[in-house]
Interface confidence: low
């Protein structure tokens, strides 16, 4: 129905809390480089006039759409230009125009500082003076960063860290039990975020169709036991909940995510037996249990894949009549059957399924052509499971932090011209897919691998497009979104490549490495990893492990002699000469 | 034997065009990747251009590019290197090079190279 203020509709429904939230994430996921404060005034300025529109719908602009406030708010920020440059320009235009104009200038990868956790009593003294305050320091610094977050979802981690604060904050050890627990919290939500930004470039590049597909490929694998025309009607609404989050229509967004999770919780008998313990919970939370509920019991009596789509006399018929329904109805049966498939081959399955009748319908015989589609299948399955297997063997033989090296090794070979940060930041990623999915039992490992690495992958595109320059990059990153990740597994040593030039500075060490935590000092250590395939891009593997055995064991050394600026000063250029010597 | 002979050299005023071939015998050719790397008097070696042996990729130091243009004629044996709008600072003597085949570490010691030809621009 349509309502007379969009602004009073969306904070009636969503409340005064919940409302502010999502203002203050739109706001910093649209201009990055404004402060907390300047974003929190706007937000108690929106909120404010939102209240008067709620008082009275016919108050002077209640009418106006939400971009048209939202962007006139954001227009009249002083200094924009200075600030930001031609994203000042998108204030010249008219809506829908200028909203695309600021989506299009959202930056993957802002220059801002890591986003650091304060030491424990700190933090505890902040939350405790103003936790509302805290809470919005959190969502603003996440969301500047990661400016396609999937805002309900921050709400509900912001809800999460409020609760964790409660909680540790009253301890005696507050470090203790801060630490690992926050740690849990980052980690999801940077897989979150990956995983979000996935889906908008979907949406993005190839559509609604595109996304309406993913969701109902990952829809049937979850509820096997709801039919086609449920799947249907969740993946449109799913659909439509991510195009608002994705073209920055928050309130929208979070809003009809609330009423999808109503929908399930009242239908729950049609769709999955697995989904009570998840209603039973208050929105934020309810919410995100459904986005990760486990797999319903798939039906005992599914017939064999064949019977409809092979063997049927009417399939071209069929296929005819209603493509996009015939396939859509070929990926639903084919999903709820294998909840061991990634989505990303599912989608592969479904496109070669597509490509088949296309070719065959069109000939004399066609059952004859379309009647081994089915075998067909089995190299593009087979791919992936020995992608899993040889990974998790490799993970489980090395542990995360030398596999996370393997692959440095393996992707700066591929595309050596890649900047080392980026390099450095996305063998890191793909390493953690060996602790979050080789432990997993064997039958949720390939999903959750490839479906994980093909976000990864979507976030060195998305980097490599703002300064290519890596051909391989670019020829796997311009492809359809389901063959990337078979299209980076296949690149080789980038043969065009002429090495860099060996400098001593690159592998040059200070005292100062000894202090840094754990993490960072693993990251200088495969900074130099990358620099050193960068120099020498055929060297063996036995190679780079003698000369990084001999770096870890020189800063081991070094940080524990009595005088470490002396040893560096000494044992480095050593180290570097014997460095050069084991790569000759 | 592998030989890689650059031709084309010279003097020449700034803002003006030299085109260096590289004729190539001994190996392959026609599915080689092949480089320009130049040195300047008193300076390293500095890539200038890549192609590869399809000429599908093409890359060049930020330094030429735009006045430069790598080609190749598979069928002649030959590489090329089209030069415009010359300045002062691309005097140097130019080599065209290949990586050995089975080298397995890629460095410049790992190249065949040709004998070199000068280009010297200056007023």
């Known amino acids: 129905e349509a309502h007379k203020s969009e602004i009073a509709h969306r904070y009636n429904d969503l409340g005064e809390q919940h409302f502010k939230g999502l203002v203050l994430i739109a706001f910093s996921q649209y201009l990055q480089k404004c402060s907390y404060d300047e974003h929190a005034k706007l937000v108690q300025e929106v909120t404010d006039f939102a209240k008067t529109c709620v008082a009275d719908e016919s108050a002077a602009n209640c009418d106006k759409s939400l971009h048209t406030l939202f962007g006139d708010k954001l227009c009249a920020i002083p200094n924009l230009r200075e600030n930001y440059g031609e994203l000042a320009d998108c204030c010249t235009k008219q809506e829908p125009e200028r909203n695309e104009c600021f989506l299009q200038h959202k930056d993957d990868n802002p220059s801002l500082p890591p986003f650091e956790r304060p030491e424990a009593e700190a933090m505890c003294t902040s939350f405790k003076e103003n936790p509302t305050t805290f809470m919005g320091h959190y969502l603003h610094e996440v969301a500047r960063r990661h400016p396609y977050f999937y805002a309900p979802e921050l709400l509900y981690y912001a809800e999460q860290y409020n609760e964790i604060l409660t909680q540790c904050c009253a301890e005696a050890d507050k470090e203790s039990c801060l630490t690992p627990k926050l740690d849990g919290v980052k980690e999801k939500a940077l897989v979150s975020s990956v995983r979000q930004r996935m889906k908008c470039s979907s949406m993005q590049k190839f559509g609604e169709r595109a996304f309406k597909a993913w969701a109902v490929a990952r829809l049937s694998q979850t509820f096997p036991n709801a039919d086609f025309a449920e799947i249907t009607k969740l993946a449109t609404d799913l659909t439509k909940v991510n195009k608002e989050c994705c073209h920055g229509d928050l309130l929208e967004c979070a809003d009809d995510r609330a009423e999808l999770a109503k929908y399930m919780c009242e239908n729950q008998a049609t769709i999955s037996s697995k989904l009570q313990t998840c209603c039973d919970k208050p929105l934020l939370k309810k919410a995100h249990c459904l986005s990760e509920v486990e797999h319903d019991t798939m039906p005992a009596d599914l017939p064999a894949i064949a019977a409809d789509f092979v063997e049927d006399q009417e399939v071209c018929k069929n296929y005819a009549e209603a493509k996009d329904v015939f396939l859509g109805t070929f990926l639903y049966e084919y999903s709820r059957r294998h909840p061991d498939y990634s989505v990303s081959l599912l989608l592969r399955l479904a496109k070669k399924y597509e490509a088949t009748l296309e070719k065959c319908c069109a000939e004399a015989n066609p059952p004859a052509c379309y009647g081994t589609v089915l075998a067909e299948f089995q190299p593009l399955v087979e791919e992936p499971k020995n992608l899993v297997k040889t990974n998790c063997d490799l993970y489980e033989k090395l542990g995360e932090y030398g596999f996370q090296n393997a692959i440095l090794v393996r992707y700066t070979q591929k595309a050596p011209q890649v900047s080392t940060p980026t390099l450095v930041e996305a063998a890191r990623n793909l390493g953690r897919v060996g602790t979050k999915c080789c432990t997993l039992p064997e039958d949720q490992r390939l999903p959750c691998v490839e479906d994980y690495l093909s976000a990864i992958l979507n976030r060195v595109c998305l980097l490599h497009e703002k300064t290519p320059v890596s051909e391989h990059v670019t020829k796997c990153c311009s492809g359809s979104l389901v063959e990337r990740r078979p299209c980076f597994s296949a690149l080789t040593v980038d043969e065009t490549y002429v090495p860099k030039e060996f400098k001593a500075e690159t592998f040059t060490f200070h005292s100062d490495i000894c202090t840094l935590p754990e993490k960072e000092k693993q990251i200088k250590k495969q900074t130099a990893l990358a620099e050193l395939v960068k120099h020498k891009p055929k060297a063996t593997a036995e190679q780079l492990k003698t000369v990084m055995d001999d770096f870890a064991q020189f800063l081991d050394t070094c940080c524990k002699a009595a005088d470490k600026d002396t040893c560096f000063s000494t044992e480095g250029p050593n180290l570097v000469t014997r460095c050069k010597d084991a790569l000759a | 034997e592998v030989q890689l002979v650059e031709s084309g050299g010279g003097e020449v005023q700034p803002g003006g065009s030299l085109r260096l071939s590289c004729a190539a015998s001994?190996?392959?050719?026609?599915?080689?990747?092949m480089v320009w790397v130049r040195q300047a008097p008193g300076k390293g070696l500095e890539w200038v251009s890549t192609?590869?042996?399809?000429?599908?990729?093409?890359r060049y130091a930020e330094s030429v590019k735009g006045r430069f243009t790598i080609s190749r004629d598979n069928a002649k044996n030959t590489l090329y290197l089209q030069m415009n709008s010359l300045r002062a600072e691309d005097t140097a003597v130019y080599y065209c090079?290949?990586?050995?085949?089975?080298?397995?570490?890629?460095?410049?010691?790992?190249?065949?190279w040709g004998q070199g030809t000068l280009v010297t621009v200056k007023p």
């Open positions: 192609i590869s042996d399809d000429a599908r990729i093409i």
């Open positions: 090079a290949t990586y050995r085949a089975g080298s397995r570490i890629g460095s410049y010691e790992d190249y065949y």
């Open positions: 001994g190996f392959a050719f026609s599915t080689s990747g």
